[in-house]
């Protein structure tokens, strides 16, 4: 006899990184026939939705019109069919960005390097933070943590053409409150094309992550996105 229903999926639209005072929608997808969904935030009940008619709806949306640091944190959802509750969803880490200041991102020896050269990014923020995050745009995105009083080093080691791309960094005041993003730094790597097929792939974010985030930042527009795996958020745990 089944004691619980399968866990629902949870995600944020347009993005789990939400600029301060912008809007975000938290989506929870369970099963057709669910009579109630509950959204929990940091262990406490945050919101409830009772879809009508339940047999025709398998997803609910909770709108947050005005993101702030009080709402940044870990969310999960559950749903109920009759008297039977589901397992809780995976955790969704909702991050508020554009807090306080803007870090400076630089790269050594420079933005144009040859394949095999050692490259280090430096993210600097003079306000009180000790954790920094380096993000690379695109499908093959890497998210790295770094630590330092005002500056963190991100050594990429000997680079390949797979490291080509646009990088930004954030200062992190806590796991769920980040600074403004730095200005982008574009890394150009010239080298042997044969090496690219052997380059390590790390699909941490979907291809349009930064496009979506920047859309949120600049216009606050809502945009429906396909469900995607939030393994990227493991960096927060």
């Amino acid at each position: 006899q089944q004691q619980t229903l399968p866990k629902p999926f949870i995600w944020a639209e347009p993005h789990f990184m939400v600029p301060k005072e912008k809007q975000v929608t938290i989506c929870c997808q369970g099963n057709y026939g669910a009579v109630e969904y509950q959204l929990h935030f940091e262990g406490s009940l945050f919101a409830v939705d009772r879809p009508k008619p339940p047999e025709r709806i398998n997803k609910v949306k909770f709108y947050i019109p005005d993101m702030n640091s009080r709402m940044a944190g870990q969310y999960s959802c559950i749903y109920r069919v009759g008297e039977l509750w589901s397992e809780p969803s995976n955790l969704l880490d909702l991050v508020v960005t554009e807090m306080y200041d803007t870090p400076t991102l630089s790269v050594h020896p420079g933005p144009e390097v040859i394949s095999g050269e050692k490259v280090t990014f430096y993210c600097r923020l003079d306000t009180a933070t000790s954790m920094f995050l380096l993000l690379k745009e695109g499908r093959s995105s890497h998210v790295q943590r770094g630590y330092g009083k005002v500056q963190a080093e991100f050594p990429l080691g000997p680079v390949t053409t797979a490291h080509r791309g646009t990088y930004r960094c954030f200062g992190s005041y806590n796991n769920h409150a980040w600074s403004f993003p730095s200005e982008p730094v574009k890394l150009l790597v010239t080298g042997d094309i044969e090496n690219t097929s052997l380059a390590p792939e790390d699909p941490t974010f979907p291809a349009d992550t930064w496009g979506t985030y920047l859309l949120t930042t600049e216009t606050g527009l809502q945009k429906d996105h396909a469900l995607w795996d939030h393994t990227a958020q493991n960096l927060l745990r």
Epitope: F46, A47, V48, D49, R70
Partner: nanobody, 126 residues
């Protein structure tokens, strides 16, 4: 900008009733989810009841069966009908709104609300 003004508070005996009103300014009331919270002296603000745009409701266990939340979109007003009042219901009662939101969402956590009233005092004593 939404402004919320509570009224209807006062002193009542245990077992008595009161009806609180919260009048909202602006044309956005129909797109708002509404809630009532309360704060007793020396305690944290706590959830009491909430109502969605589509009139779904949710109550704190401590008031279930005694309090009823309702809304009148034509009057831009949300109500809290309180009956069988107890001494532990003594508190300042605050009205709050989430604007805008989806139709059937009911918000329970105070962090979700982006507009708040100034509060009205309810005192229950013999």
């Amino acid at each position: 900008e939404v402004q919320l003004v509570e009224s209807g508070g006062g002193e009542v005996q245990p077992g008595g009733s009161l009806r609180l009103s919260c009048a909202a300014s602006g044309r956005t009331f129909a797109s708002a989810a509404m809630g009532w919270f309360r704060q007793a002296p020396g305690k944290e603000r706590e959830f009491v009841a909430a109502i969605s745009r589509s009139d779904d409701t949710y109550y704190a266990e401590s008031v279930k069966g005694r309090f009823t939340i309702s809304r009148d979109n034509a009057k831009n007003t949300v109500y809290l009908q309180m009956s069988s009042l107890r001494a532990e219901d003594t508190a300042v009662y605050y009205c709050a709104a989430v604007v805008p939101t989806y139709g059937s969402s009911i918000y329970v956590h105070s962090a979700a609300y982006n507009y708040w009233g100034q509060g009205t005092l309810v005192t229950v004593k013999p």
